[in-house]
């Protein structure tokens, strides 16, 4: 039993950032006569968080009108509580003097803020990876507290097992940080494949945030490639397809070579999309065979996203009768197909 | 039961130095403050001082230079040391409980006389 | 120092009647929303008994027919009705600054 007693009844309030926390505080004698101050923290570093006497505290207010007559209770709000308002906040009475002392401090409230999670951000590989290949995302959420938070990735609905993933900081903050990394295996068919970082905190009310990333902004998907020739016209004129087949994505450039001279570059634009999000493309040429002597070597040259050329030659006869020409041509391929 | 009992020793010469004790008993000394009042035959009362739970102690200023409160939490005694005391010190002498004044002792007299 | 000043210095009441007393500090003695001033009853061979508190709450165990009111410096301890066994000396006391002082008292008889 004491004469006085500072009696902050919980131990831990817990509150959501933005919203008003209430430190509640009463006292069971109002005398010796003296002040009662709110701080935060313990010892010589202490900060003060509400004097009635004197003091500027815009965000606090006494619950109870302090200036009236044999009130006890010295209990406080702290509006729009953020991260950086946790902590444990002390009651204390003070006996007047000069200047006041110390009498006795409540057994403190440990202040702790809700905070949400960032949106998490999602971000890929700087270059595109060809299928078979591994390609690392990031996901990153900031700002949360309590430090308890679960992160899971996702392709395609799937769980993906090989993940990495941080808090931090690792001590006590008022806020924290989580990084997280997942190691994905690409396949040809991951054009129209997403990846999601999915993060789940006690301030979402079992109701997750999600971050994505396309794969297609990862994946590159070379082409095939194939010359065919037409049978020739009555015109001496033979028609040479190059089918560019099942690439991603669509920046790719188009050269016909005739006998190793560059006759026509095309790019390829406004292609429709096949149904697992590749692009083809069809370019043809035309030979005027009577126009040469000897055989003409054409070579269809495929630039595709900035990679090294791919080539497929096609050899025209022009010794053989016309009628004969389909038996007679022979197509040469001078480069190999990225698979 | 909150009790509180002073013991002196009733004559005191002149310029001489006053003693008293006041034992407790029902409650701590480390929670509660003890003050010391006192009364001229027929006269009021005069706060003397306080000696608090803690240990810190607040005097009349007016005696102030001649007076010392102490305490011994385990014995739960508080002491009352007045130095150079005249016959206008002549009174009964009082503990009493806490900065409330909620329970006093019955009062020891002390006469100041040769 | 506060000095306090009581009046009257005595009365005398007719059983049942009431009595009122009166104590002005020479500054106020109200801090933090309260006034530090008490009112204790004394009789002749025994120490004070403490009656109220803070100017106007009562202290367990102290019958309602007693009283008290006032702030900053003027407050009154009253009696309502009195009853023989009300014939005492009631002194009051503030303990807003230090050094704590007492009123002169005042002596209540009843006719």
């Known amino acids: 039993e004491e004469e006085l007693q500072v009696i902050q009844p919980e131990k831990s309030v817990s509150v959501a950032a933005g919203d008003s926390a209430t430190l509640n505080c009463t006292v069971s004698s109002l005398i010796p006569v003296g002040p009662i101050q709110w701080f935060r923290g313990a010892g010589p570093g202490r900060e003060l968080i509400y004097n009635l006497k004197e003091g500027h505290f815009p965000r606090v207010t006494p619950v109870s009108d302090p200036t009236k007559r044999n009130n006890m209770d010295f209990s406080i709000r702290i509006s729009n509580i953020t991260p950086a308002d946790a902590g444990t906040y002390y009651c204390v009475k003070f006996r007047k003097g000069s200047p006041d002392v110390e009498l006795k401090s409540g057994a403190g409230t440990e202040l702790s803020v809700r905070a949400k999670p960032s949106a998490p951000v999602v971000s890929g590989p700087a270059v595109r990876a060809t299928a078979e290949h591994t390609v690392s995302f990031t996901c990153e959420s900031h700002g949360f507290s309590p430090r308890d938070i679960t992160l899971k990735w996702f392709k395609n609905g799937n769980e993906l097992s090989d993940v990495q993933t941080n808090v931090d900081p690792a001590g006590k903050s008022v806020s924290y940080s989580i990084r997280s990394t997942a190691r994905v295996v690409l396949t040809r068919r991951d054009v129209h494949s997403q990846v999601i970082c999915e993060v789940a905190h006690v301030t979402l009310q079992g109701d997750p945030l999600r971050g994505t990333a396309n794969l297609s902004e990862a994946i590159r998907v070379p082409p095939f490639l194939e010359v065919t020739q037409q049978s020739m016209r009555a015109d001496n004129q033979v028609n040479v397809t190059c089918q560019v087949t099942k690439f991603y994505p669509q920046r790719l450039q188009l050269t016909w070579l005739e006998n190793g001279n560059v006759s026509r570059t095309e790019m390829a634009s406004a292609l429709p999309e096949n149904k697992d999000g590749t692009y083809n493309w069809t370019s043809w040429l035309l030979v005027n065979v009577s126009a040469h002597r000897d055989d003409v070597k054409l070579t269809c040259q495929v630039e595709h996203d900035g990679q090294p050329a791919v080539n497929k030659s096609f050899s025209v006869k022009v010794s053989a009768h016309p009628k004969e020409q389909g038996s007679n041509t022979a197509a040469e391929n001078t480069g190999t197909n990225e698979r | 039961e909150v009790q509180l009992e002073e013991s002196g020793p009733g004559l005191v010469a002149p310029s001489q130095s006053l003693s008293i004790t006041c034992t407790v008993s029902g409650f701590s000394l480390t929670g509660y403050g003890v003050n010391w009042v006192r009364q001229p035959p027929g006269k009021g009362l005069e706060w003397l001082g306080i000696?608090?739970?803690?240990?810190?102690?607040d005097y009349n200023s007016a005696l102030k230079s001649r007076l010392s409160i102490s305490k011994d939490n385990s014995k739960s005694q508080v002491f009352l040391k007045m130095n150079s005391l005249q016959s206008d010190d002549t009174a009964r002498y009082y503990c009493a409980r806490a900065g409330k004044m909620d329970y006093w002792g019955q009062g020891t007299s002390v006469t100041v006389s040769s | 120092d506060i000095v306090l000043t009581q009046s009257p210095a005595s009365l005398a009441v007719s059983l049942g009647q009431g009595a009122t007393i009166s104590c002005r500090a020479s500054e106020s003695v109200d801090s933090y929303g309260n006034s530090f001033m008490h009112w204790y009853q004394q009789k002749p061979g025994q120490p004070p008994k403490p009656l109220i508190y803070l100017a106007s709450n009562l202290e367990s165990g102290v019958p309602a027919r007693f009283s008290g009111s006032g702030s900053r410096t003027d407050f009154t301890l009253t009696i309502d009705p009195v009853e023989a066994d009300d014939a005492a000396t009631y002194y009051c006391?503030?303990?807003?600054?230090?050094?704590?002082?007492f009123g002169g008292g005042t002596k209540l008889e009843i006719k």
């Open positions: 006391q503030q303990n807003n600054e230090y050094p704590w002082t």
């Open positions: 000696i608090w739970g803690d240990g810190s102690t």
